[in-house]
Interface confidence: medium
């Protein structure tokens, strides 16, 4: 027990001596951040002269500064042991380690090339002032349907499947929150919806078979005799678009 | 100062269902395309899903049908649905931010919520 | 399907080392440059270190780069710090879905 005791203290002098003889060789050490070592001033701690500043300890000199000028703006304001940092003024947005440049924002719809900004090529969309276009989501994957088309700025909304969208289908809700077991307000309203209908489409038969003007009837048939139709993804302006320089647009715009 | 921090982890039982929250403070989520990415023990990171700054939501193959992502702008908030949960869904859940300057690198990350299904 | 190989899956280095680790991916990544690379420590989340296969994010030292375009890779830590020793990870976005996909991961050990 005492020789560990021992070498506690032991170790504790060693320490606490080395670091007095470091303190002696290297007067340097003992600067702290926000001061240098003045070599001629018989290696004193100075304080960092402004504009400057010493992050660490120990240093022999001071870094200048960062400036955050023309297209940079002032996000921290330098002080002795740390350096400015800058942000982008608006219309811009930081780019690289530390915000070394500013790059363009863009509207959405577009995103930013070599050649500035550059509408979204059909088929993708930006609904963001910065980054880049993103292909559509392909609702066919999921086995549904496309429901609302795609834009440049907005992507397309996914509906159920071709399957489900039969022309008595309901449209596309989102799930309502559950309820507790019993007649729902819910229920109710869709027995009403479908007995309305269910009453509606007998009348429409009845007014139809009593019909006399038989041009209207074959409209009538032409109505029901198309197919149903899924949206489709219409064409866009294609002018400018990012994707018509495959080589100089990081790989364009291939899907 | 900006972060993210994910709860509602814990245990759960096989066939059970758990639901991840992803809160934000010092940034707007609503501005960001927001991920939720997994770390089984041991494993590597495996991409769960993403919902985009406008509600476009994507699933990696694996989360399709199971998880599902949702957002709460007035929140600030990103939540991540888990049903019908397996062993093998064991992991640290993490919510990520996408790069300001890319939209496909998370440059800010939650500290994670570890999920345990177990019996 | 997507797939993202990384290689080595480890690697013995000592500090002062050069470093480098290579991902292949199949297909191309979007744009041809829509990979980033990642550093995760044990019990911490990842922390990006590249985004758009080659540009630094803000903070992270000089010795990283990155390198490639479209299906080929690589991260170089040009001088091995004691800080360095983790676990990296590239990952790569996809047009398909706007998937993304993570490589297996290579843990850098001291030697």
């Known amino acids: 027990m005492g020789n560990s005791c021992y070498n506690i203290v032991a170790t504790l002098l060693l320490v606490l001596n080395f670091e007095r003889t470091r303190s002696l060789q290297d007067p340097c050490s003992n600067c702290p951040a926000g001061t240098f070592c003045d070599n001629n001033r018989n290696q004193i701690c100075s304080p960092c002269p402004p504009n400057s500043f010493s992050s660490a300890g120990g240093q022999r000199t001071c870094d200048i500064c960062r400036q955050c000028k023309g297209v940079f703006r002032t996000r921290k304001e330098c002080s002795s042991t740390s350096n400015a940092e800058c942000d982008c003024t608006p219309g811009f947005h930081c780019l690289g380690a530390g915000c070394s440049m500013c790059e363009q924002d863009c509207k959405q719809g577009q995103e930013l090339t070599k050649k500035g900004c550059k509408d979204c090529c059909f088929g993708t969309f930006n609904d963001q002032k910065r980054g880049i276009c993103r292909p559509w989501t392909n609702c066919s994957l999921d086995g549904k349907s496309v429901l609302v088309n795609g834009t440049k700025e907005r992507d397309v909304v996914c509906g159920p499947s071709p399957a489900d969208l039969s022309p008595g289908a309901s449209s596309v809700t989102p799930p309502a929150p559950a309820r507790e077991p019993g007649h729902s307000p819910q229920i109710i309203s869709f027995f009403l919806a479908l007995t309305s209908t269910a009453l509606l489409f007998l009348l429409f038969f009845l007014t139809l078979r009593f019909s006399v003007v038989k041009r209207g009837r074959k409209k009538l048939l032409y109505i029901f005799k198309q197919p149903f139709m899924r949206p489709v993804q219409t064409t866009q302006e294609e002018d400018g678009c990012s994707c018509r320089f495959p080589e100089e647009e990081e790989g364009g715009c291939e899907l | 100062e900006v972060q993210l921090v994910e709860s509602g982890g814990g245990l759960v039982q096989p066939g059970g269902s758990l639901r991840l929250s992803c809160t934000a403070s010092?940034?707007?989520?609503?501005?960001?395309?927001m991920s939720w990415v997994r770390q089984a023990p041991g494993k590597g990171l495996e991409y769960i899903g993403m919902?985009?700054?406008?509600?476009?939501?994507h699933y990696a193959n694996s989360a399709k049908g199971r998880f599902t992502i949702s957002k709460d702008n007035t929140k600030n908030t990103v939540d991540l649905q888990m049903n019908s949960l397996r062993a093998e869904d064991t992991a640290v859940y993490y919510c990520a931010r996408d790069s300001y300057n890319s939209d496909y690198a998370f440059n800010l990350w939650g500290q994670g919520t570890l999920v345990t299904v177990s019996s | 399907d997507i797939q993202m190989t990384q290689s080595p899956s480890s690697v013995s280095a000592s500090v002062g080392d050069r470093v480098t680790i290579t991902c292949q991916s199949s297909?191309?990544?979007?744009?041809?440059?829509?990979l980033a690379w990642y550093q995760q420590k044990p019990g911490k989340a990842p922390k990006l270190l590249i985004y758009l296969a080659s540009t630094l994010a803000s903070g992270v030292p000089s010795r990283f780069s990155g390198s490639g375009s479209g299906t080929d890779f690589t991260l170089t830590i040009s001088s091995l710090q004691p800080e360095d020793f983790a676990t990296y990870y590239c990952a790569g976005g996809y047009s398909s879905s706007s998937d993304t996909a993570f490589g297996g991961g290579t843990k850098v050990e001291i030697k």
């Open positions: 010092g940034i707007d989520l609503s501005a960001y395309h």
């Open positions: 297909p191309s990544v979007y744009k041809n440059n829509q």
């Open positions: 919902i985009g700054s406008s509600g476009t939501i």
